[in-house]
């Protein structure tokens, strides 16, 4: 009596289907209206249907749930809590669904949830307890292994009166629930800085994507604890130079690959250590593509081709000799 078709094909639930069985409670494994379901593939797709809420009649078998391209606006506490629970749900994609608020405990009662994608949602209000589910100082560990939060920054006029970076980091660190997180993507979020404590509390990270942000410096960021880190994406930021401490930390990570393309490197005397390091290290991918942006006389010079004589700083004149 399930409308789900056999094999791996998808069955669509036509809008009239729900009314056809409307006198009875929903069948446990029926396909929600405006969704496509494949029991064989354990997959439900409710994609680009302008849904305004998470369907309450999701089939218990669902392992992969796509709710992309909708108009959900808000994920309340227990948005996916069902009786019986969605015990198999492992991958949840909510990207591009116009979410502006994710509340505490939104992903509670999903014991198998390993991958979560909230990308391309203007998250003006991300609860500190969105992922941990409780405000305890140490929460039950989240099963999440992969958290994709690319382009979740809301428009300027919709931001709360607080640091967006701080809001996101608070959610990542609450209750130390994400200790098992291996992949974290935070690309395209206009981050100006990376709070210094965030990486130290995510010791299992293998992949960290911070590309296409506005990071100017990594001076206060420590990578020392990330001994499992395999890839660090820092392309398309506003980095001017990497200082000795950062270089040493990156060099000390056994499996690391670092991506540094398209940053406005300032090729003055402060760049000497980084150039020396680049010439020796194997950790930077595509290091031959890195070029100077400033000063003007150095624009487009390849970092690897520079020598110490090229990297000078204009002397700082005493105030009495400075001209207006």
């Amino acid at each position: 009596s399930s409308p789900t078709s056999s094999a791996s094909s998808f069955s669509s639930s036509a809008p009239f289907l729900a009314s056809a069985v409307s006198a009875q409670p929903p069948l446990p494994d029926q396909c929600p209206a405006l969704c496509e379901c494949s029991e064989a593939a354990r997959t439900v797709k409710c994609v680009n249907r302008n849904l305004t809420e998470v369907p309450t009649d999701l089939p218990a078998y669902v392992r992969n749930l796509f709710l992309t391209g909708n108009q959900l606006a808000v994920l309340p506490a227990g948005a996916f809590a069902r009786r019986p629970p969605l015990a198999e749900l492992a991958a949840l994609n909510l990207s591009g669904s116009r979410l502006d608020e994710v509340r505490a405990g939104a992903f509670e009662h999903l014991p198998s949830l390993r991958q979560l994608d909230l990308s391309h949602n203007p998250l003006a209000d991300l609860s500190p307890f969105a992922f941990s589910g409780s405000n305890a100082s140490v929460s039950a560990p989240s099963p999440l292994v992969e958290l994709i939060l690319n382009h979740i920054v809301p428009p300027e006029d919709e931001r709360q009166n607080r640091s967006f970076e701080g809001m996101v980091v608070a959610a990542l660190l609450a209750g130390r629930a994400l200790q098992g997180l291996r992949r974290l993507e935070l690309a395209s979020n206009h981050f100006l800085y990376l709070p210094r404590d965030v990486l130290a509390q995510l010791p299992s990270l293998r992949h960290l994507d911070l590309s296409n942000n506005s990071l100017v410096s990594l001076t206060y960021v420590s990578f020392r604890n990330l001994t499992h880190l395999e890839s660090l994406h820092l392309e398309d930021n506003a980095l001017k130079v990497l200082h000795n401490g950062t270089l040493a930390e990156l060099q000390g990570l056994p499996h690391i690959r670092v991506f540094l393309d398209n940053n406005p490197w300032v090729c003055d005397c402060h760049m000497a250590d980084m150039v020396t390091w680049l010439k020796e290290t194997e950790v930077v991918q595509g290091k031959d593509r890195l070029t100077c942006a400033y000063p003007e006389k150095m624009r487009n010079r390849v970092l690897l081709e520079l020598n110490s004589a090229d990297l000078d700083c204009d002397p700082i004149l005493p105030p009495s000799l400075q001209t207006s």
Partner: antibody, heavy 121, light 107 residues
Framework: EVQLVESGGGLVQPGGSLRLSCAAS????????MNWVRQAPGKGLEWVSY????????YYADSVKGRFTISRDNAKNSLYLQMNSLRDEDTAVYYC??????????????WGRGTLVTVSS | DIQMTQSPSSLSASVGDRVTITCRAS??????LNWFQQKPGKAPNLLIY???ILQSGVPSRFSGSGSGTDFTLTISSLQPEDFATYYC?????????FGGGTKVEIK
């Protein structure tokens, strides 16, 4: 005229069943979520149940969960409430009320006149 | 569940009076607070939604304010047709809940 009209109320014994209907007219019924709200004699308002426009999102108050079933037929512009295992405390006027695009952040901007359900032996 | 507490439960006032009814939520509900008016034997009628937005056709003497947990409905100059019972209701989370009501009577 934009309106909601409830029917199906009446006297029923405890443990009995009743099915309420709400007929909508004057607006595009299939575009709106709908709710049932009740009011016991001389008491305040109590939200009972919610159903979204395509029937894939349904919520109930704890007091009726497992006993009441909300449903709708967009082709007939009708909302229903199947009430089973009725109790004395279910005695109330039952209103159907139009909601917004989701249960949260919404409001009831159109109400029916209500239908009285009396549960008594 | 979020409890909604209205005060006072009843009040007596005269035509022309300024009347204020308060509604307190047991936890924050942001701005998702609605106000209804109900007259005896009639269905409720939406006055204000999302704290302060006046429903179409509702007189401008009605206004709403507040945020978080504390909200207020104000009738700037009470008219004879305003004697009724007023309910607040939160739409922040399910179950949706109403306040106990405030009965506005003629003094």
């Amino acid at each position: 005229e934009v309106q909601l009209v409830e029917s199906g109320g009446g006297l029923v014994q405890p443990g009995g069943s009743l099915r309420l209907s709400c007929a909508a007219s004057g607006f595009t019924f299939s575009s709106y979520s709908m709710n049932w709200v009740r009011q016991a004699p001389g008491k305040g308002l109590e939200w009972v149940s919610y159903i979204n426009s395509v029937s894939n999102t349904i919520y109930y108050a704890d007091s009726v969960k497992g006993r009441f079933t909300i449903s709708r037929d967009n082709a007939k512009n009708s909302l229903y409430l199947q009430m089973n295992s009725l109790r004395d405390e279910d005695t109330a006027v039952y209103y159907c009320a139009r909601g917004g695009v989701r249960v949260l952040r919404s409001y009831f901007d159109l109400w029916g006149r209500g239908t009285l359900v009396t549960v008594s032996s | 569940d979020i409890q909604m507490t209205q005060s006072p439960s009843s009040l007596s006032a005269s035509v022309g009076d300024r009347v204020t009814i308060t509604c307190r939520a047991s936890q924050t509900i942001s701005s998702y607070l609605n106000w209804f008016q109900q007259k005896p034997g009639k269905a409720p009628n939406l006055l204000i939604y999302t704290t302060s937005i006046l429903q179409s056709g509702v007189p401008s003497r009605f206004s709403g304010s507040g945020s978080g947990t504390d909200f207020t409905l104000t009738i700037s100059s009470l008219q004879p047709e305003d004697f009724a019972t007023y309910y607040c209701q939160q739409s922040y989370s399910t179950p949706l809940t109403f306040g106990g009501g405030t009965k506005v009577e003629i003094k």
